[in-house]
Each structure stands twice: as C-alpha cells, then as structure tokens.
C-alpha cells in the first residue's frame, strides 16, 4: 500500500534543481519555465495534468508578455496540420509543429515535442497570470485532434533515461498575493522523473489510474468531519473523477456538490453564509487574522487503495477549499471564496485537493500517490491527512462506465 | 483602480430591445461576477441578475428572466445586458456592480428612455 | 423574496448631529446586509457589508449594527457632504432586495 520498497533508478529522493521550480497560485494555475526553439526563447507554461497538448501562445494577444516566435527558430518544424480546441467556454487553435523544448528547472535534456502554435484563443489565457502557454501532462488518448499527437511527457521518455514518472508539489499561500508577490513567491514543485522525500511527510498511498486518458481515480466514500454523506459511491465518480492541475476548485457532481454543501453548512451553522458564498459569488470576510477555521469541517475522500477491498483516504480542511482572496474594498479583513463547485463533467481533484498533498503520477506503474505535503497550510489544531488501509467492498461498482463520445473538459 | 465604465444613454422605441455594455479594468475579470440593477425614479433599486465571467454562469431575478439576458466577453473584459421587448416600464437607470462582499463597485449608470 | 423596509422616506438633520437609519428584513439574514449612499444623480457608494464593516475609505463617522432582521446605520457627527440618499441591501438570499431609502436633508 505504501512506497516502501527499494527505490528504484531515477528515484534518488532528491532533485534539488527541480525542487521549487514552479510558481504562480490556485486561482489562476501554477507555471514551469520552459525554452522553445533555437536559440531557445524562454516561456512560463502551465501545469496541466487536466489536458494532453503542447500549445504555446504564438501571436500577440492583450494578456501575453511574449510569445513563441516560430520564425526565429532554426529547428522549428512545420506539420503542416491545425488544431482547434474548443471548451465549455472559450478555444484556443493554432498551427501544429515540432521543435526542441527543455526545462531549464528540470531534467537536463533537450527532446524534440510537438508544439501547437495558438494563432487565436477566446477565454483562454488569463490576464495578469504570467504563463504564455499550457503543459498538457495526461495521455495521448484526449490529445488534440487525435491520439495520433504525442503528448510531451511520451515524447520525454522515449527520447531519455527520464523514468516514466512526475510528481507535482502545489504549494498554496494561504493568503492572497499581488502581482509582484506571485513573482517572487515559490508556488511549488514539479520534479520530473522520480520522487523527492523532503516535499512530504509520512508515506505515500497509491490509488490506480482506471484508464489512460485523463488522470482518472475512483472515490469509493466521502466524509464531511468524519460524517459519511452515505451516497452511492458511483455518484462520486459520475460521470469520471480526475486529478487536474490545471482546475482551480475540487468541483463536485451537481448531487455530490448538494449533499457536500448541505453537510458542510450544517456543521459550520454557528455562522450564517450567504447562499451567494456557496455559489462562488460572494466572499467571506473576518478581521485580520480571526478566521474561524474551526467551525468549518474536514473533507475526506477515499480513494481505492493497490490492494483488493483496500482504501485509504485524503482529508483536506478549510485552509484548502477556502481560497483567500484580495479585494481593495475589503482589504482590512481576511476575505475568501468557497472552492468547492458543481461540476456536469464528474469529479475534478483540482489545485484545492492537490494543495494539500505531494501527488506522485507514476505512470510506469499505472498508478497516483498522494502524501501529506510539507508546504500545506494548516493551523496548530489540524492537519492534512493520508490513512489507511481501510476496508472496502466491492469498489470497482463505484466506477462509471462512460459511453463512447469524444470529449474534452481542458482547463474548466 | 477597479473600475466598471457603462455605455452611455439610450433612447429607444417601444418594442424594440438595447444592449448596454459595462467595460471592467483594475482587477483580474474572471474571478468576481457582474450584477445589474435597475433604478426608476421613486422605485429603489431592484437586482436583474448577474454573470460569472469565468463560465457565462447567470442567475436571474425571476422578474426580469424573461426580460433581461446577460453575456459576457472576457477577451474584452466586458459584460453585456440585453433588454428585449422594451415598454415604458423599462424607462430607468441601469447599474452594474461588481460583487466582493455584497456590490463594492458600481458602474456609473446608463439612463435608457423608451419613448415613441 | 425578502422585503426589506426602510420606515423613514426622508430624515431631517443637522451638521454635527447623530443619525440613525434603520431597516428591517421580513426575514432572518444574518448579518449579510449592506448599506450604500447615492448622491443626486450619481450611482451607490457602498459604505458598509456584513452589517457592521466599513468598506475601505468610508470615514468611520460611518457604522453599521444589527444582526438578524433589525439593522441600523449610524452617521455621526453628519457632515454636510452626508446628503444623500441611503440605502440597505441584504445579500443573504436571492433575489437581492434593497429596501426603499431614505432621503438624509440636512438643516
């Protein structure tokens, strides 16, 4: 159940070069520096565990620094293809080609990846966000336009010794930051290629990846302060549940999201919310430095364990799915917004979930491991927490099985 | 700054519709939703509605569903009303308002005056 | 829907002079209530949110009471610049509701 046998090559425990390599915060995605082309042009890329593609903005847009200037590039390859993307809510398309990309922070390779060069996009870079292009981590099987697209971190493997294996330390403030804040703060890890023992404390429980597209997870119970919501465990994982970086909220099945809301504001009665707060309208404030974290409860997932009739669970507490924001008008106080939202598309594990744990997507092994990491915030009463074993039947009924359709959710 | 600059006046005919717009700046426009109020003159402030900016979520005052409708255009940072069927009971002053805690920020009001 | 009432239309003050503007809900609320302040022919100025906290940069002759379904706004020392209309609004539960007004004259 636990990472405790002899490690293997490529997870040395420590990769000091990688570690705090990642900055930026919840609300508006966590970004790596990456060089594109030769000579090499320096972006800042989201982390997106969500998506599969490459795509770097390569046009001028309002909300873009700089950009991907493919002609300045000696080793650009054109493929002579399009991409178009479309979401929810807004696109993004552009021009597919090939190039040599590394990570400075990051494994000292160069490989040769697939870039999609975004021409045009509609609510999709974010103004003030500092990162000119995405890092589509998950599988070839929800590339854009087909699966035929080999995603970055495949074409990383094949090309290098790097171990078929990332993990992500997302680090939360715990405060709201300015511009000027967010660009000196650390915002975290992505360590490429192994595991580093010093962004966690305690062990590592896995949970499989049902299948290879999304980073797709079940949830077999949840626990609003150790209270079960007593659903069936398929409602958790209507119609998926995944664990996307590039999400801010943990968004929840619209009867997941209800029952969750439901238990929450009954245990945190002793204040009366607007009902605009569990919408995500309006913000919660207190005077600086009285909030009441301890009116509001834990929030446990369980996720299956590596072993048959086996769970563990993840609990996370109010300093994560209550995201502190920054509002000129009430600057005096504390002020947050409620994280948790309704979701038409499954469970999405986003940065509110991910904040509170070190995630190991060790795809060499089909599997995601979550410890308690060591740059979640909590206070001196409670703390993020990963237990287990625990005892569960019949987990594999809580899986839905989604009938065929191509679909996307990028970035929701 | 945060700011929320409308559209200016509007004189229309009576059973026809208007647009108004409301241009924000001074904050990042995704992560707060637009309100829109109406004032008549001796009538208070009534809430139309509003939009979440992030996902073109609305939710309406059940009064107004059928009148008003809202969109936004985040390349833009703008946010839209549409008023359609226009009579003289739609003669007001239109605010948006951006929510925080309750509305910390109004537009500067656009006057519509239906008149034939 | 919530009704929220203003009692008093118009209220008569003069500079210097305490005033309190009252308002009630038809309903609990908690203290999700706000106060703003619109000067002729100008839009609302939100002075007050969770009954009692002053926005930033409203002068702190401006406060704000009550929880539940009775709430009171409180100018004191009114100033002549205070003339104005006042408005309370709960945010508790859709649909928003404002109520009436109240029309501060000063002497």
């Known amino acids: 159940e636990t990472d405790e046998e002899p490690e293997e090559p490529g997870r040395r425990g420590s990769f000091v070069e990688m570690v705090d390599n990642l900055r930026g915060k919840s609300g508006q995605g966590y970004y790596v520096e990456m060089t594109v082309g030769s000579p090499p042009q320096t972006l800042n890329i989201l982390v997106d565990t969500g998506s599969s593609n490459f795509a770097v903005g390569a046009a001028p847009h309002p909300f873009l620094h700089r950009y991907y200037q493919r002609q300045l590039s000696s080793t650009y390859r054109d493929l002579r293809k399009g991409v178009y993307v479309p979401y929810t809510q807004g696109k993004w398309e552009g021009e597919l080609g090939t190039d040599l990309v590394s990570i400075p922070h990051g494994p000292n390779v160069t490989v040769r990846a697939n870039i999609a060069a975004i021409t045009e996009s509609d609510k999709f870079f974010i103004n003030g966000s500092n990162w000119e292009g995405i890092l589509g981590l998950a599988y070839a099987e929800i590339a854009r336009p087909d699966d035929s697209l080999e995603p970055f971190f495949d074409s990383l493997v094949k090309q290098t010794h790097v171990p078929n294996l990332f993990s992500l330390q997302l680090c939360g403030a715990g405060f709201p930051l300015n511009q000027s804040e967010v660009l000196a703060s650390v915002g975290g890890s992505m360590i490429i290629g192994g595991i580093d023992h010093s962004l966690y404390t305690g062990s590592l429980w896995y949970t499989p990846i049902r299948r290879e597209w999304y980073y797709e997870v079940i949830i077999v119970r949840v626990e609003i302060n150790g209270q079960d919501l007593k659903m069936d465990c398929k409602e958790y994982n209507y119609d998926k549940s995944i664990v996307d970086s590039g999400t801010t909220n943990l968004r929840l099945p619209k009867k997941v999201f209800e029952a969750a809301v439901k238990s929450i504001k009954a245990a945190s009665s002793t204040e009366k919310f607007p009902d605009g707060f569990w919408l995500g309208e309006q913000l919660v404030c207190w005077q600086a430095g009285t909030t009441p974290w301890n009116i509001f409860p834990v929030i446990s997932l369980y996720l299956m364990g590596e072993v048959t009739n086996q769970s563990f669970r993840i609990t996370i507490l109010p300093q994560q799915y209550l995201r502190p924001v920054e509002d000129v008008a009430t600057s005096q106080d504390d002020c947050y917004k409620f994280a948790i939202s309704q979701s038409s598309t499954g469970t999405v594990m986003g940065a509110v979930i991910m904040e509170g744990f070190y995630v190991v997507f060790d795809r060499a092994r089909k599997r995601i491991g979550f410890a308690v990491s060591a740059c979640h915030v909590h206070d001196e009463f409670r703390t993020a927490a990963v237990e287990g074993p625990f005892v569960t039947l019949d987990m594999e009924d809580c899986g839905y099985n989604i009938p065929q359709t191509d679909e996307s959710t990028l970035m929701t | 700054e945060v700011q929320l600059q409308q559209s200016g006046a509007e004189l229309v005919r009576p059973g026809t519709s208007v647009k108004l717009s409301c241009k924000a700046s001074g904050y990042t426009f995704t992560s707060y939703w637009i309100h829109w109020v109406k004032q008549r003159p001796g009538q208070g402030l009534e809430w139309?509605?509003?939009?979440?900016?992030?996902?073109?979520?609305?939710k309406y005052n059940q009064k107004f569903k059928d009148k008003a409708t809202l969109t936004v255009d985040t390349s833009s940072s703008t946010t839209y009303m549409h008023l359609s069927s226009l009579t003289s009971e739609d003669s007001a002053v239109y605010y948006c308002?951006?929510?925080?805690?309750?509305?910390?920020?109004w537009g500067q009001r656009t006057l519509v005056t239906v008149s034939a | 829907d919530i009704v929220m009432t203003q009692s008093q239309k118009f209220m008569s003050t003069s500079v210097g002079d305490r005033v309190s503007v009252t308002c009630k809900a038809s309903?609990?609320?908690?203290?999700?209530v706000a106060w703003y302040q619109q000067k002729s022919g100008q839009s609302p100025k939100a002075l007050i949110y969770s009954a009692s906290h002053r926005y930033s940069g409203v002068p702190d002759r401006f406060t704000g009471s009550g929880s539940g379904t009775d709430f009171t706004l409180t100018i004191s020392n009114v100033q002549s610049e205070d003339l104005a209309e006042y408005f309370c609004q709960q945010y508790n539960s859709y649909p928003y509701t404002f109520g009436g007004g109240t029309k501060l004259e000063i002497k």
């Open positions: 308002a951006r929510s925080g805690v309750a509305f910390p920020y």
């Open positions: 139309i509605g509003m939009i979440d900016p992030s996902d073109s979520y609305t």
């Open positions: 309903q609990n609320v908690g203290t999700n």
